[in-house]
């Protein structure tokens, strides 16, 4: 996990200022309001399970 301002997060992840670490973009399907989802250049999340 990288500190902000250094190397970017690995492919498929994005920096979360709230959690102070890289987070999986895949989790934006479940939690689209997460701060790091703004940095995820994926297609709009599919409808979630609940």
């Amino acid at each position: 996990e990288q500190a902000p301002g250094t190397a970017p997060c690995s492919r498929g992840s994005s920096w979360s200022a709230d959690l102070d670490k890289c987070m999986d973009c895949a989790s934006c399907r479940a939690r689209p309001a997460s701060d790091f989802c703004l940095g995820c250049a994926a297609a709009p999340p599919a409808p979630f399970r609940l």
Partner: antibody, heavy 119, light 111 residues
């Protein structure tokens, strides 16, 4: 480092109650969803219940087999969460694990605590 | 509920060879971008440990000998080359919907 420390468990008679606790440290507890997962030789690993974060209105979800019997709750101010189990039956016997997830996979796990329901 | 079927139930692999474990979901657990399938390793007396998330993403600290693949309903965990320390039971789990369900496990023995 991340730790999930469990307490509770033991021997309880059929129809009895038990409360399990899990205290978290080393991560931003309030942002994570918390679950209980149990394991038995008969049913393997079985997700039991989940409580989401404040931003998700502390929504709770339960496996069909425990709906109306088990209640999951959390106390973000003390980084702990609980499983209240009522009307216990023999099929509830197993090892109970607390676990955290941001959304999908079970990242951190407690050490497990044994529950035996028997007369 | 989505049923997760793991095969084989057990296998014995020689040291340094490849172990392949399969997991089939009763319905698709993938979008066009991600697969909501995860793999765990469990040793006796310990809780499960996350190995692979989202079908193919290696968890931090897990050796590159472990790899995952698949999409839709069919997924595979590969371990190559296997080491003595890999003796354990391996489980798949989906997070497509509630209830989250696990496979029945595959017990790996190193010969």
């Amino acid at each position: 480092q991340v730790q999930l420390q469990q307490s509770g468990g033991g021997l309880v008679q059929p129809g009895g109650s038990m409360k399990l606790s899990c205290i978290a440290s080393g991560f931003t507890f309030s942002s994570y969803w918390m679950s209980w997962v149990r394991q038995s030789p008969e049913k393997g690993l079985e997700w039991v219940a989940e409580i989401r974060s404040k931003s998700d209105n502390y929504a709770t979800h339960y496996a069909e087999s425990v709906k109306g019997k088990f209640t999951i709750s959390r106390d973000d101010s003390k980084s702990r969460f609980f499983l209240q189990m009522n009307n216990l039956r023999a099929e509830d016997t197993g090892i109970y694990y607390c676990s955290s997830t941001y959304a999908d996979y079970f990242h951190y796990w407690g050490q497990g605590t044994d529950l035996t329901v028997s007369s | 509920d989505i049923v997760m079927t793991q095969t084989p139930a057990s296998l014995a692999v020689s040291l340094g060879q490849r172990a392949t474990i399969s997991c089939r979901a009763s319905q698709s657990v993938s979008t066009s971008t991600y697969s909501y399938m995860h793999w765990y390793q469990q040793k006796p007396g310990q809780p499960p440990k996350l190995l692979i998330k989202y079908a193919s993403s290696l968890e931090s600290g897990v050796p590159a000998r472990f790899s995952g693949s698949g999409s839709g309903t069919d997924f595979t965990l590969n371990i190559h080359p296997v080491e003595e320390d890999d003796t354990a039971t391996y489980y798949c789990q989906h997070s497509w919907e509630i209830p989250y369900t696990f496979g029945g496990g595959t017990k790996l023995e190193i010969k």
